[in-house]
């Protein structure tokens, strides 16, 4: 099978998911690719409990999550429905601000220093969090 029953080395298990927290920065697309090569995805926050868990691990540092509106509407990278799902934006965010002078608006979401979300320029080199789900019915041994 291709499922996971336990988390890879250096990943943190929480509520049937595995999380990896970067300590350096990349642009959103590069962080996204990094997670995909780990057979994972940028973190998708589905509850206040998961928000607090991630916030505890990243501290007060701008950190990318798997939420963007590069193609129009806001979308989670794993297909989780944005409209009906958990949200934790800062007041008056997202605002697709154009005043940064870098060209275009702001299409990628990140955790801010207080954990609440902001949209920002996707090229900014922020830290990131990868997430992958654990599956119960695995025939594969744990990753070593």
């Amino acid at each position: 099978g291709s499922e996971r029953t336990c988390c890879p080395v250096n990943w943190v298990e929480h509520e049937r998911s595995c999380y990896w927290f970067s300590r350096s920065g990349k642009a959103w697309a590069d962080a996204d690719n990094y997670c995909r090569l780990e057979d994972a995805h940028l973190v998708v926050v589905t509850s206040w409990e998961e928000q607090k868990f991630v916030q505890h691990h990243i501290g007060p540092v701008n950190t990318w999550m798997g939420l963007h509106d590069q193609n129009g509407p806001w979308k989670w990278v794993d297909g989780t429905d944005y409209e009906t799902g958990f949200k934790n934006w800062r007041p008056e965010q997202p605002d697709d601000w154009y005043g940064h002078g870098l060209g275009g608006g702001e299409d990628c979401a990140h955790f801010t220093d207080d954990g609440r979300w902001n949209d920002d320029v996707c090229q900014r080199p922020y830290r990131w969090v990868c997430e992958t789900e654990l599956d119960k019915a695995s025939q594969e041994p744990p990753l070593l």
Epitope: S2, P8, S24, D30, N33, Y34, R36, L37, P125, L144
Partner: antibody, heavy 121, light 109 residues
């Protein structure tokens, strides 16, 4: 001992196909993304393709996109590169390489010895 | 695309010399820079990762420095086995680029 061993290279005509293999040993193969990197005679290194540890994600250099397919069989600890519509400019030594990670830094930390692919009529 | 440019493209030196090779990136890649050594007919070998971290088993005469767009590989006291071609590689946006520099050939003077 950690080892990668490529095979499947040879002489092929333009427009032809070839399948390269890379047998891995000495590490948990399914835990690591794997790449193909090539080197034309007398030239530098060119990354070709990469596949995630469980095969869910693949990426290709623009120069081979639509012609080459990377795959893996974790039960056999083997990486593959299916090369179709081969061109003279694909002539190179093809290396398989393991994607190692320290922190968030990715590097090719283990390389095979390479297999030569010659595209000529 | 990020372009990686090495200088010089070739270099003659003697055993015991101190040698420095430079790699420049066309945009900021922070410390996402690796160095490889390749001897004729052999596969490349990882020397330095994250700009300055020495790969396990690599002699301490090799060192790397730099960040942003300019990086250097230094061999403090050149040994006979160090004559080879050296490549830098950015790992900021890998994939889909994984760009290597064009290489620096280190030859015996």
């Amino acid at each position: 001992e950690v080892q990668l061993l490529e095979s499947g290279g040879g002489l092929v005509q333009p427009g032809g196909s070839l399948r390269l293999s890379c047998a891995a040993s000495g590490f948990t193969f399914s835990s690591y993304a794997m790449s193909w990197v090539r080197q034309a005679p007398g030239k530098g290194l060119e990354w070709v393709s990469v596949i995630s540890g469980r095969g869910g994600s693949t990426y290709y250099a623009d120069s081979v996109k639509g012609r080459f397919t990377i795959s893996r069989d974790n039960s056999k600890n083997t990486l593959y590169l299916q090369m179709n519509s081969l061109r003279a400019e694909d002539t190179a030594v093809y290396y398989c390489a393991k994607r190692g990670i320290v922190g968030a830094t990715e590097a090719f930390d283990i390389w095979g010895q390479g297999t030569m692919v010659t595209v000529s009529s | 695309d990020i372009q990686m440019t090495q200088s010089p493209s070739s270099l003659s030196a003697s055993v015991g010399d101190r040698v420095t090779i430079t790699c420049r990136a066309s945009q900021n890649i922070y410390s996402y820079l690796n160095w490889y050594q390749q001897k004729p007919g052999k596969a490349p070998k990882l020397l330095i990762y994250a700009a300055s971290s020495l790969q396990s088993g690599v002699p301490s005469r090799f060192s790397g420095s730099g960040s942003g767009t300019e990086f250097t590989l230094t061999i403090s006291i050149l040994q006979p086995e160090d004559f080879a071609t050296y490549y830098c590689q950015q790992s900021y946006n890998t994939p889909p680029e994984c760009n290597f520099g064009q290489g620096t050939k280190l030859e015996i003077k």
